[in-house]
Interface confidence: medium
């Protein structure tokens, strides 16, 4: 239903908490520069607005589209050129262009210092001394850093810091309880990040009809009691809202998600008998326990898949009569059927269906042709399979930093062109994937394996866009989404790779590293040890091994040390001569 | 090309019954949800009642609940109302629905005349 004010509508849709939250991620999303202060004054002046929207819609400039408004706030900042260079160039675009524009400008990687957080007592003082300050600087710092973040539910992950925050601050050891706590919101909302953004690429990309067509595989697995109408009436909606949220129409795409969380807690009967817990909670919490809720009993009665896609005499008949809605049913069926695969899987499955339809409905015999289709996705099916039973056997092996070591030098190896800083951290994100999955029982495993992976992938497609280097990496990644992870795994040795001369500065360390903390540590490791790939593309997996043991002792020998700057300075080079002797 | 034939009304007296089907054919008649809907005379459509592809789940409207009952048989590709207790208020035309999007139904019959009346 059209409204005479949008903004309005939304503001009292929300409410004033979620709306104001919701602005300062948008600004935040938008200009990442700008500091807490400058954007706060901005919400405050669009949450008066849309006050005086809210008591009279007739009201000057309210029946402009919230696009405009944010857009006119952002383009009337002082010095917009100065900070932001081009992006200021926006500013002389009309809408929608204008918005099209800042899309365009949003920044994956921005340039700011990695988020710290404060010593628990002073977290604590600025928490009790001013809430809402406190949670608008977690939203306004994230929103930054992570420009397509799900903005619901980042408000999701305000309120969870906030309930941590006020249960915490009063026990007598702070820090016992918050750094647990708050690791743990922080490793949910970094993955959630990583996901979203992955959405983002994949609407961006490959349009609505993939991302929907991912949709009604996921919502298929969680809800396989529901009908296929019911499924497709889901994937729209999810569809709908995500696009929103990419697009940067955040007000409309937080409704939006509120309104189907309402839809399925009233059709719980239609959609699956696991919602009833979730339909208790309050909103932001309700659509969040929607969204990671675990998949109903699959019905004990299925039909074989065999019956409706390859058995029946109509197959052809009813593939030509309305293609997607075929497909779509096809995709229905088999993801209810396997909660098991990943939705990377289903879908190749489904393109893979789709490509033997199109190839034999034009031929002769079309059954003949098309009845050995469910057995020639046996390979498709074994592939992840086993990369799921290889990698988490290394990683049982190896533990999480071994494992990530292992993956780091693997990745070095197929793509040494990209930076060391951008490999180090794909690494390790993909080395997670270890203790994320690895510990799942059989049954979860590839889905939680593949489709974390297929994240991870995402993000450094993402970054390597930006400064494309590698040929391979532009390969894998131009591709369909679905073959990324596939593409990356089948990489081998890039051959081409001029390895990259030995710099005694690259490995050359102070006593400053004594007294990082651990994850920093390793980081510094993990950055040598892709230097030496980078040095050595084809060195084996004892001489590294040998090196990074080596320098392993030599750390921990100097941090022991007396005169640690000392130890650092005349044993240093002799770990080097011996590093370049051993990788010979 | 998509066809729902209705058949099975005429006139009843109150309290009497019937039995409506309805004929598809033109698309995998297993895979919808399908339902009937009424027109009374001078009176805007009211949802009567649907039933899921695989005939698990059904609604029906308050005015008709415990008195009317849809059912489908895949295999004849035929979806059924069977009504019972008629009353003068359920005179309409009923006609049969094909569904493509959960409650948002894409195809309709031509419609079958049910009259109660003394």
């Known amino acids: 239903e059209a409204h005479k004010s949008e903004i309005a509508h939304r503001f009292k849709d929300l409410g004033e908490q979620h709306f104001k939250g919701l602005v300062l991620i948008a600004f935040s999303q938008y200009l990442q520069k700008c500091p807490y202060e400058e954007h706060i004054k901005l919400v405050q002046e669009v949450t008066d607005f849309a006050k005086t929207c809210v008591a009279d819609e007739n009201a000057e400039n309210c029946d402009k589209s919230i696009h405009t408004l944010f857009g006119d706030k952002l383009c009337a900042i002082p010095k917009l050129r100065d900070n932001y260079g081009e992006l200021a160039d926006c500013c002389a675009k009309q809408e929608p262009e204008r918005n099209e524009c800042f899309l365009q400008h949003k920044d994956d990687n921005p340039n700011l210092p990695p988020f710290q957080r404060p010593e628990a007592e002073a977290m604590c003082t600025s928490f009790q001394e001013n809430p809402t300050s406190f949670l608008g600087h977690y939203l306004h710092e994230v929103a930054r850093r992570h420009p397509y973040f799900y903005a619901p539910e980042l408000l999701y992950y305000a309120e969870k810091y906030n309930e941590v925050l006020t249960q915490c601050c009063t026990e007598s050891d702070k820090a016992a309880c918050l750094t647990p706590k708050l690791d743990a919101v922080k490793e949910k909302a970094l993955v959630a990040a990583v996901r979203q953004r992955m959405k983002c690429s994949s609407m961006q990309r490959f349009g609505e009809r993939a991302f929907k067509a991912w949709a009604v595989a996921r919502m298929s697995q969680r809800f396989p009691n529901a009908e296929f109408a019911e499924i497709t009436k889901l994937a729209t909606d999810v569809t709908k809202i995500n696009k929103e949220c990419c697009h940067g129409d955040l007000l409309e795409c937080a409704d939006d998600r509120a309104e189907l969380a309402k839809y399925m807690c009233e059709n719980q009967a239609t959609i699956s008998s696991k919602l009833q817990a979730c339909c208790d909670k309050p909103v932001l919490q309700k659509s969040q326990c929607l969204a990671e809720i675990e998949h109903d009993n699959i019905p004990a009665d299925l039909p074989s898949i065999a019956a409706d896609f390859v058995e029946d005499k109509e197959v052809c008949k009813n593939y030509a009569e309305a293609k997607d809605v075929f497909l779509g049913t096809f995709l229905y069926e088999y993801s209810r059927r396997h909660p098991d695969y990943s939705v990377s899987l289903l879908l190749r499955l489904a393109k893979k269906y789709e490509a033997t339809l199109e190839k034999c409905c034009a031929e002769g015999d079309p059954p003949a042709c098309y009845g050995t289709v469910l057995a020639e996705f046996q390979p498709l099916v074994e592939e992840p399979k086993n990369l799921v039973k290889t990698n988490c056997e290394l990683y049982e092996k190896l533990g999480e930093y071994g494992f990530q070591n292992a993956v780091l030098v693997r990745y070095t190896q197929k793509a040494p062109q990209v930076s060391t800083p951008t490999l180090v951290e794909a690494a390790r994100n993909l080395g997670r994937v270890g203790t994320k999955c690895c510990t799942l029982p059989e049954a979860q495993r590839l889905p939680c394996v593949e489709d974390y992976l297929s994240a991870i992938l995402n993000r450094l497609c993402v970054l390597h866009e930006k400064t494309p280097v590698s040929e391979k990496v532009t390969k894998c990644c131009s591709g369909s989404l679905v073959e990324r992870r596939p593409c990356f795994s089948a990489l081998t040795v890039d051959e081409t790779y001029v390895p990259k001369e030995f710099k005694a500065e690259t490995f050359t360390f102070h006593s400053d590293i004594c007294t990082l903390p651990d994850k920093e540590k390793q980081i510094k490791k993990q950055t040598a040890l892709a230097e030496l790939v980078k040095h050595k593309p084809k060195a084996t997996e004892d001489q590294l091994k040998t090196v990074m043991g080596d320098f392993a002792q030599f750390v921990d020998k100097c941090c022991k040390a007396a005169d640690k700057d000392n130890c650092f300075a005349t044993e240093g080079p002799n770990l080097v001569a011996r590093s370049k002797e051993a990788l010979a | 090309e998509v066809q729902l034939l209705e058949s099975g009304g005429g006139l009843v007296q109150p309290g009497g019954s019937l039995r409506l089907s309805c004929t598809a054919s033109?698309?995998?008649?297993?895979?919808?949800?399908m339902g009937w809907v009424r027109q009374a005379p001078g009176k805007g459509l009211e949802w009567v009642s649907w039933?899921?592809?695989?005939?698990?789940?059904?609604y029906y409207a308050d005015s008709v609940k415990g008195r009317f009952t849809i059912s489908r048989d895949n295999s004849k590709n035929t979806l059924y109302l069977q009504m019972n207790s008629l009353r003068a208020e359920d005179t309409a035309v009923y006609y049969c629905?094909?569904?493509?999007?959960?409650?948002?139904?894409?195809?309709w019959g031509q419609g079958t005349l049910v009259t109660v009346s003394s």
């Open positions: 039933i899921r592809p695989d005939g698990t789940f059904t």
């Open positions: 033109g698309f995998t008649f297993r895979h919808y949800r």
């Open positions: 629905a094909k569904s493509y999007h959960a409650d948002k139904f894409d195809y």
